[in-house]
């Protein structure tokens, strides 16, 4: 499947997941905490202040690094999966903290967490991963 299609599908699934999570957690626009979001790279579930959310490396990096193998499991498609099974010390895990001021930036940043072979990428199709 072309990357454009992958990401449109991922985004649509993300918005559905967020809606379900909001209902389960009793979240609404006036709730304290951090709303679920699609950051154009991956999906982040809603969270309470003080909560750290962990996700596996997104699909984008399976396109960037097709040979990369991560030890962590992929977040389930039907929901957000069990983030308790993920550990920040694992390669392939990214976190965001929900603070009083909103979401922190990813830690580590995606490239550091998910790996990126810069040399290998030089030979790749430079338009392959445009998300438009």
């Amino acid at each position: 499947m072309h990357s454009d299609c992958i990401f449109k599908k991922e985004q649509a699934m993300c918005l559905e997941k967020i809606q379900r999570a909001n209902e389960l957690m009793g979240f609404n626009d006036s709730s304290p905490g951090c709303p679920g979001m699609w950051d154009n790279i991956t999906c982040w579930k809603p969270a309470h202040v003080g909560e750290m959310v962990l996700v596996s490396c997104p699909e984008l990096f399976r396109i960037f690094n097709p040979d990369q193998v991560w030890e962590t499991e992929t977040i389930g498609e039907s929901d957000f999966g069990d983030s308790n099974s993920l550990d920040l010390s694992d390669m392939g895990v990214v976190s965001r903290n929900c603070t009083e001021d909103g979401w922190s930036e990813p830690f580590p940043h995606y490239f550091d967490a998910c790996g990126f072979d810069e040399y290998e990428s030089e030979t790749g199709d430079q338009d392959y991963y445009y998300l438009s």
């Epitope: 603070t99 995606y110 998300l131």
Partner: antibody
């Protein structure tokens, strides 16, 4: 090797506009976030803006929000900074830097900068 | 925005001495704190990422530590080429910010 070359700086009057460019080579430009960082003469570094690899995410410092626009043309391996309503306090050496990430990241390689002087 | 404070503003030392530079954040930045070196007339150079991670090509005398709000850059034994300005930078919260810098000069 990674190379970033800024251009477009110069002397401009307050209230006018200027567009800076940054030509990138030596890496796959379209996979990296890019930053603009500035440095007023004899002062420290000030982060200005960042744009994600595909241009879908753009973030700005409060001091430039609403006046500056960051953009990129991945087909030309070029980063831009459109600066409108320039003020004397915008006088600085403007650096473009590669962000080591798709979304934002920290600057890991820097250009040599282009000087913008806002003066009447 | 997160404000980074660096101390001291200037550090006067001799070659061979140990330099200890501090960076304090107004709110926790976890470990998303990076250190840069800038020499006169040159662009900044990334020295340390994520508070303590070393980078290839950077001499082993440079090391970093800390997390949350308090961070330290240590130069174990100053070489003549190390006299420069050092900046910390946080990439934990937008807008990103830099500290005001610490100038390490020759005593």
């Amino acid at each position: 090797q990674v190379q970033l070359v800024e251009s477009g700086g110069g002397v401009v009057q307050p209230g006018r506009s200027l567009r800076l460019s940054c030509a990138a080579s030596g890496f796959t430009f379209s996979r990296f976030a890019m930053h603009w960082v500035r440095q007023a003469p004899g002062k420290g570094l000030e982060w200005v803006a960042v744009i994600s690899f595909d241009g879908g995410n753009k973030y700005y410092a409060e001091s430039v929000k609403g006046r500056f626009t960051i953009s990129r043309d991945n087909s030309k391996n070029t980063l831009y900074l459109q600066m409108n309503s320039l003020r004397a306090e915008d006088t600085a050496l403007f650096y473009c830097a590669r962000g080591y990430d798709v979304l934002t990241g920290y600057p890991d390689y820097w250009g040599q900068g282009t000087l913008v002087t806002v003066s009447s | 925005e997160i404000v980074l404070t660096q101390s001291p503003a200037t550090l006067s030392l001799s070659p061979g001495e140990r330099a200890t530079l501090s960076c304090r954040a107004s709110k926790s930045v976890g470990r998303s704190l990076h250190w840069y070196q800038q020499k006169p007339g040159q662009a900044p150079r990334l020295l340390i990422k994520y508070a303590s991670q070393s980078l290839s090509g950077i001499p082993a005398r440079f090391s970093g530590s800390g997390s949350g709000t308090d961070f330290t850059l240590t130069i174990s034994s100053l070489e003549p080429e190390d006299f420069a300005v050092y900046y910390c930078h946080q990439s934990s919260r937008l807008p990103f910010t830099f500290g005001p810098g610490t100038k390490v000069d020759i005593k």
